[in-house]
Amino acid sequence: LVPHLGDREKRDSVCPQGKYIHPQNNSICCTKCHKGTYLYNDCPGPGQDTDCRECESGSFTASENHLRHCLSCSKCRKEMGQVEISSCTVDRDTVCGCRKNQYRHYWSENLFQCFNCSLCLNGTVHLSCQEKQNTVCTCHAGFFLRENECVSCSNCKKSLECTKLCLPQIENVKGTEDSGTT
């Protein structure tokens, strides 16, 4: 099966790598612009230079291109706890991340929120916190895991999944209650 190519890809594939086909004259291949620049004017003829201009402040191109405009720099989302790891330059977009001892939770492909890594209080660290994953905790006896926190079995209701982990404690509580009633 031949993969479907868009018009731009079809046009580019006629020219050697690093060049693109002139939009008004398909017999001319123009040199693409370097990263950090954009296409101001197509090359006037074969072997002649493409007019590329440097991206203005607040914009970038990260690879060779024949874009008519540079791309706008991303802004880190403060409302999601994001911080700027590195500023935008003409050839690289802003890099956003989280603070130390935080991890990224992706709500969607291009939206993440920063959260504090769990400390595993009343438990031990099974897997350390990673850039995109919270700490994985193992709870001490008498505690169960709820939303990645070790919670006392005294907070375990019979209807919840924790009953298996807290079975001895629940039976003891039941026994105590029974012995107190005559």
Epitope: R77, K78, W107, Q113, F115, N148
Partner: nanobody
Framework: EVQLLESGGGLVQPGGSLRLSCAAS????????MAWVRQAPGKGLEWVSH????????YYADSVKGRFTISRDNSKNTLYLQMNSLRAEDTAVYYC????????????WGQGTLVTVSS
């Protein structure tokens, strides 16, 4: 008691508009991010849009960018979603939600309002 009550859903033709509202009570509405999340039939949850406490920062999923507008009125404890140029693929139950700042869950959810885009 915390309540998030969505309204404004319904049946609309492709290209039409709807305005969803979410009336909040039982918590300090003006603190923190509020979001609209949707679930299309047989699909998972999709984060549609969010807005920060003062409305100064907004986010839109690529699928709705340029068509949907999120806003809030903290004096009325209400969140809005203006939906224009609606498409069949926007058909879903739309939920108003308050994301937690402590863990990747929602502190509060509404019951949802159904938006059906069909001719």
């Amino acid at each position: 008691e915390v309540q998030l009550l969505e309204s404004g859903g319904g049946l609309v033709q492709p290209g039409g508009s709807l305005r969803l509202s979410c009336a909040a009570s039982g918590f300090t509405f003006g603190n923190g991010v509020m979001a609209w999340v949707r679930q299309a039939p047989g699909k998972g949850l999709e984060w549609v849009s969010h807005i920060n406490e003062n409305g100064g920062a907004t986010y839109y999923a690529d699928s709705v960018k340029g068509r949907f507008t999120i806003s809030r009125d903290n004096s009325k404890n209400t969140l809005y979603l203006q939906m224009n140029s609606l498409r069949a693929e926007d058909t879903a139950v739309y939920y108003c939600a308050k994301p937690s700042i402590e863990s990747p869950i929602f502190d509060y959810w509404g019951q949802g309002t159904l938006v059906t885009v069909s001719s």
